[in-house]
């Protein structure tokens, strides 16, 4: 379970498609 | 203005821990990602660990997962890297670095004046 | 997974220098190129392929496709004489450098 605290925060993974991007990298979604 | 300033390297022996810090100033902390990026003497980059905005969000190199440790303090706009169980193949220059602003932060814009660390017994 | 560049690349004073950077489906991915000048730290000076920071001269440029990443800079100063490093992720876990390139300007 995430921690309360971080539950506002983005969270960034690495994938393809992602972010309006038509490539791969990192990408960060709250 | 913008900056990133290292501190904690040294001399350690094999085995043994050093923790490192890297103060920020010049920008909101909290917003942005971080990283610990080394380079061995006379050789190229090497990508250590990041950091984003959650703690709970960090990931590793292979090369270091389970002897280091990042983290962040933001009340104190502070980087860390506790390094563990070193290694002869962990000397190297240690840089902090900003990873960029906004949704999709692939590079790395600001950097700090690094700091060495040399494992030798 | 592994970034290869030239060890080395000569130019003359105001001619154009061309940096590459191989890597398996490179093109697929958002490539970086860093300036690192002697007893200096690296500098950010092409981001997501070719937009350049704040900054950074006109003069340098970027591209990627295939399976190649290009570092271009045109009418190269004495002062772009340097290191150069490329940069991508490939996976959460695994951010890739280019072994690096001395740019030495003849």
């Known amino acids: 379970r995430r921690r309360r605290r971080d539950t506002h925060f983005p969270i960034c993974i690495f994938c393809c498609g992602c972010c309006h991007r038509s490539k791969c990298g990192m990408c960060c979604k709250t | 203005q913008v900056q990133l300033v290292e501190s904690g390297g040294g001399v350690v022996q094999p085995g043994r821990s050093l923790r490192l810090s890297c103060a920020a100033s010049g920008f909101t902390f909290s917003s942005y990602g971080m990283h610990w990026v080394r380079q061995a003497p006379g050789k190229g980059l090497e990508w250590v660990a990041v950091i984003w905005y959650a703690e709970s969000n960090k990931y590793y190199a292979d090369s270091v997962k389970g002897r280091f440790t990042i983290s962040r303090d933001n009340s104190k706009n502070t980087l860390y890297l506790q390094m563990n169980s070193l290694r002869a193949e962990d000397t190297a220059v240690y840089y902090c670095a900003r990873a960029q602003e906004g949704i999709a932060p692939d590079a790395f814009d600001i950097w700090g004046q690094g700091t060495m660390v040399t494992v030798s017994s | 997974y592994e970034l290869t560049q030239p060890p080395s690349v000569s130019v003359s004073p105001g001619q154009t220098a061309t940096i590459t950077c191989s890597g398996d489906k490179l093109g697929e991915r958002y490539a970086s190129w860093y300036q690192q000048r002697p007893g200096q730290s690296p500098v950010l000076v092409i981001y997501?392929?070719?937009k350049r920071p704040s900054g950074i001269p006109e003069r340098f440029s970027g591209s990627n496709s295939g399976n190649t990443a290009t570092l271009t800079i045109s009418g190269t100063q004495a002062m772009d004489e340097a290191d150069y490093f490329c940069q991508a992720w490939y996976s959460s876990t695994n951010v890739l450098f280019g072994g690096g390139t001395k740019l030495t300007v003849l």
């Open positions: 997501q392929d070719s």
